[in-house]
């Protein structure tokens, strides 16, 4: 029961703005240090902004409750979503495959990263901080955070492109099943997401520091090469640009093109013949758009706080504490909203898509294909399917079944 001692953070420029400080619940993991110390390069310790602790203490418990809720809802919701799409052949189509990919990315984050974060919140230290497993977790945690959000944004982009393609080539038809191009898209999305997350796995290390003499270790981004220094400098802008603006711009472009396409073909005779399918496609497009809007709302506060911190906040300013309190509060709210994005998609689909609502209800009671009554439903690709309890393969596909993804 030795008392500990005060802090030094190895040759690292430590500022007194942190997420959760240390809780870096979101994928936007910045350096994780003791936040009550500022160690500029001259090696002197600066006075602390005391409001920080009050905010940190309050959010420690709020974050824990929210994280546990997200863990349960996210695990049940995303796992159910995957089960629905996997178990029902009628649900296996292009857009649903992308939604399943989205759900799997969220599920990985929820199951692996959230428990680590809750431990860090409650224990005030990194799990297994004195052995090699702690080092492994230190690299895995930010890697999975970035991978998960990468999977989210790239899947949202793919869904937007898919909606445009469905409208642009609506005269071509396709039955049930995941198109090869969609499968390649999904594999590419996952590979690219993992590649883009590699700098996190490289840069995050267990950095030793002292607090009142006792040696502690914490997981933080510690640039040791020119590339990692560059990555650390541009990280907030890169995250904002690629992981936030890009999916929104992508959606805006392809939804504008889709609208133009629909307006251009407004008077076509074929459009009248396929009016029901167009209606269904609009529903699917609305669902995808809803997912993008939810993503934007969940991530905007966190990105905004990071950009403001990068551009407005000056740690050497004597009057910085008020701004710091505001940014820290905004950061914590942003972290919780961003984390909620990992569990909110199944909920959104439940409310936006009648098809998913029916399947969720069936699956949570028992599961979709075990429904006792004959069930007629409209899958997300707009193809009308009928099936009975035990005959999953007895699909009676509407003859004007159409294309929602490239063959």
């Amino acid at each position: 029961d030795n008392p500990e001692r005060y802090s030094t953070n190895l040759s690292n420029h430590v500022d007194d703005f942190t997420t959760f400080r240390g809780t870096e619940l979101s994928f936007l993991v910045t350096t994780h240090q003791p936040t009550n110390l500022v160690l500029p390069s001259n090696g002197s310790m600066h006075n602390y902004c005391p409001q920080q602790t009050k905010i940190t203490s309050a959010f420690k418990y709020i974050n824990t409750v929210i994280s546990c809720t997200i863990f349960i809802v996210g695990m049940v919701g995303n796992a159910t979503l995957l089960r629905i799409i996997y178990q029902n052949k009628c649900m296996r189509n292009g857009p649903n495959a992308l939604i399943a990919s989205l759900a799997l990315g969220d599920l990985i984050y929820v199951v692996i990263d959230l428990p680590i974060n809750v431990f860090k919140l409650l224990a005030g230290r990194w799990p297994f901080d004195h052995n090699d497993f702690g080092v492994f977790l230190c690299k895995l945690f930010p890697f999975l955070q970035k991978s998960s959000v990468g999977i989210t944004v790239l899947n949202l982009c793919a869904l937007s492109v898919d909606r445009y393609r469905a409208v642009a080539s609506w005269s071509r038809v396709q039955g049930i099943g995941i198109p090869l191009v969609t499968a390649i898209e999904i594999v590419s999305i996952w590979i690219l997401s993992f590649i883009l997350a590699i700098p996190e796995a490289i840069g995050f290390v267990m950095v030793p520091f002292e607090y009142r003499g006792e040696q502690h270790k914490t997981c933080m981004l510690n640039a040791t090469s020119k590339f990692m220094e560059f990555y650390q400098d541009v990280k907030d802008w890169w995250l904002f640009g690629f992981y936030f603006c890009m999916p929104l711009v992508c959606t805006a472009i392809f939804y504008t093109l889709m609208t133009c396409e629909m307006l251009n073909r407004r008077n076509g005779s074929l459009r009248i013949a396929l009016s029901e399918h167009l209606k269904q496609r609009r529903e699917v497009a609305k669902t995808v758009f809803c997912l993008v809007v939810i993503f934007a709302l969940c991530w905007f506060p966190l990105h905004l706080s990071r950009i403001l911190k990068k551009t407005v906040y000056n740690e050497m300013d004597k009057n910085r504490c008020e701004l710091l309190s505001f940014l820290l509060l905004m950061d914590y709210i942003g972290i919780n909203l961003a984390t909620m994005n990992s569990c909110i998609n199944p909920i959104a689909l439940y409310f936006v898509s009648k098809k998913f609502k029916n399947c969720f209800q069936s699956c949570l009671c028992c599961c979709c294909y075990q429904s006792k009554s004959l069930m007629t439903s409209v899958p997300m690709n707009g193809t009308s399917i009928q099936w009975k309890n035990h005959d999953q393969n007895n699909h009676n596909t509407d003859r004007s079944s159409h294309k929602d993804s490239m063959n």
Epitope: N2, P3, E4, R5, Y6, S7, T8, T18, R21, G22, P34, T35, N36, L37, L39, G43, S44, M45, H46, N47, Y48, P50, Q51, T53, K54, T56, S57, K60, L122, A123, G124, R125, E210, Y211, R212, G213, E214, H216
Partner: antibody
């Protein structure tokens, strides 16, 4: 047994300089943070300066920042406080203390009078 | 800075009585590493301060079990269950969670 012995105090004129030392024994000096704490005549205690184990990071109270310098020589097991631009408000008993999550051992103190 | 407000300034007690000293901080004193660095020191007449309690409630080696530290967040208390003559002196609370580290103004424990 842990022993901390301060020395170097005395009478100095305002604006003058003085360096007080603290000789440590009975423990591995290089593995502990160290601090200087002063006590004025009204019995109030103030943490003046603190230094980490390797001397790489230091902290000073606002009252002494820019005038005092804390340093350590781990080879000699000695802590130093160099005081420049002394003022009458710096008159106090100066204690060195070992910091291990708390200031668990203190020296007997050395008196500094600025007059 | 974090202000440590110690009450009372003077505490007259009879030997064998219980004594209680309060210390209120202007800010939360939980450090990011989960610890709360609140300490209690006793300075007997003509001596240097001695550590009694660290991290709110941990007794330092050699400190009698009649000394008990408690509290959390911003409110902290030192209790002495049965005051003995050797306990007389000035008690200081201290926070080492956030720079600048600060002491309370002190409470003098004296015989009634």
């Amino acid at each position: 047994d842990v022993h901390l012995v301060e020395s170097g105090g005395g009478l100095v004129q305002p604006g003058g300089s003085l360096t007080v030392s603290c000789a440590a024994s009975g423990f591995t000096f290089s593995t502990y943070g160290m601090s200087w704490v002063r006590q004025t005549r009204d019995k109030r205690l103030e943490l003046v300066a603190t230094i980490n184990t390797n001397g790489g990071n230091t902290y000073y109270s606002d009252n002494v920042k820019g005038r005092f310098t804390i340093s350590r020589d781990n080879a000699k097991n000695t802590l130093y406080l160099e005081m420049r631009g002394l003022r009458s408000g710096d008159t106090a008993m100066y204690y060195c203390a070992r910091d291990y999550g708390a200031m668990d051992y203190w020296g007997q103190g050395t008196s500094v009078t600025v007059s | 800075e974090v202000v440590m407000t110690q009450t009372p300034l003077s505490l007259p007690v009879s030997l064998g009585d219980q004594a209680s000293i309060s210390c209120r901080s202007s800010h939360y004193l939980v450090h990011d590493n989960g610890n709360t660095y609140v300490e209690w020191y006793l300075q007997k007449p003509g001596q240097s301060p001695k550590l009694l309690i660290y991290k709110v409630s941990n007794r330092f080696s050699g400190v009698p079990d009649r000394f008990t530290g408690s509290g959390s967040g911003t409110d902290f208390t030192l209790k002495i269950s049965r005051v003995e003559s050797e306990d007389l002196g000035i008690y200081y609370c201290f926070q080492g969670s956030h720079f600048p580290f600060t002491f309370g103004s002190g409470t003098e424990l004296e015989i009634k």
